[in-house]
């Protein structure tokens, strides 16, 4: 015998109080599949969460985070604060990068400046809290007797510290 509730489409529920009639989901609730005996309460995006997609009778609301925060967890269950460039998020909030490290993003950790000398190169541009150093040609390439035909080796890509 077929379950009469299986005929109830998404956006409705099988109402046992009304002889298993398919009733529309009440306001602020939804059912995303057919044959449901109850509708689920819509997620409310409050506080630091903001609504990315409104709830409908067939799908839940979707939240993201207000400016200054970014989503974490499945379905943006948490909002984590952004930091400024030149900072990293610690357990006690945003802190400036220590000397010799940098972060060019609003997320993530401070990373060590590239050590140009490991590749036999010189520092062309000093690093800052926000930017990696830029490595220049090796000192040998700058000597008067060096061939002017051989171009200097490309600098290490910024943001990649040596392993």
């Amino acid at each position: 015998l077929q379950d009469p509730c299986s005929n109830c489409p998404a956006g409705t529920f099988c109402d046992n109080n009304r002889n298993q009639i398919c009733s529309p989901c009440p306001p602020n609730s939804f059912s995303s599949a057919g044959g449901q005996r109850t509708c689920d309460i819509c997620r409310q995006c409050k506080g630091v969460f903001r609504t990315r997609k409104e709830c409908s009778s067939t799908s839940n609301a979707e939240c993201d985070c207000t400016p200054g925060f970014h989503c974490l967890g499945a379905g943006c269950s948490m909002c984590e604060q952004d930091c400024k460039q030149g900072q990293e998020l610690t357990k006690k909030g945003c802190k400036d990068c220590c000397f010799g490290t940098f972060n060019d993003q609003k997320r993530g950790i401070c990373r060590p400046w590239t050590n140009c000398s490991l590749d036999g190169k010189s520092v062309l541009v000093n690093g800052t809290k926000e930017r990696d150093v830029v490595c220049g040609p090796s000192p040998a390439d700058l000597s008067p007797g060096a061939s002017s035909v051989t171009p200097p080796a490309p600098a290490r890509e910024p943001g990649h510290s040596p392993q």
Epitope: E88, L89, T90, K91, K92, K95, I109
Partner: nanobody, 124 residues
Framework: EVQLLESGGGLVQPGGSLRLSCAAS????????MTWVRQPPEKGLEWVSS????????FYADSVKGRFTISRDNSKNTLYLQMNSLRAEDTAVYYC?????????????????WGQGTTVTVSS
């Protein structure tokens, strides 16, 4: 699959107590530090407390020091947070999180897996 499942939240009056639990599975529990964080209604995530893999080292945010106690039972793969003298400002969704290393501190933000959270409401 690494999973963390919190429980123990609820409604409590100011001055009351609650004990949160976090059941872990899918990884060698004793090999990793664990952390509690919380998200108050109008704010971003706040770090609450961390404990090393062995349970020997614990760290607390200033706002909960002396009131909250973090502990773990490695034989049961469970993390705990005993919360006493609760205040209205402790109202939040509480999440347990796995850190990426065995040791921990009160600085490095090193969480890589999160639970789904349990709600704590402190109100009279």
């Amino acid at each position: 699959e690494v999973q963390l499942l919190e429980s123990g939240g609820g409604l409590v009056q100011p001055g009351g107590s609650l004990r949160l639990s976090c059941a872990a599975s899918g990884f060698t529990f004793s090999g990793y530090a664990m952390t509690w964080v919380r998200q108050p209604p109008e704010k971003g995530l706040e770090w609450v407390s961390s404990i090393s893999g062995s349970g020997n080292n614990t760290f607390y945010a200033d706002s909960v020091k002396g009131r909250f106690t973090i502990s773990r039972d490695n034989s049961k793969n469970t993390l705990y947070l005993q919360m006493n003298s609760l205040r209205a400002e402790d109202t939040a969704v509480y999440y347990c999180a796995k850190e990426g290393t065995t040791e921990t501190d009160d600085y490095h933000y090193n969480m890589d897996v999160w639970g789904q959270g349990t709600t704590v409401t402190v109100s009279s």
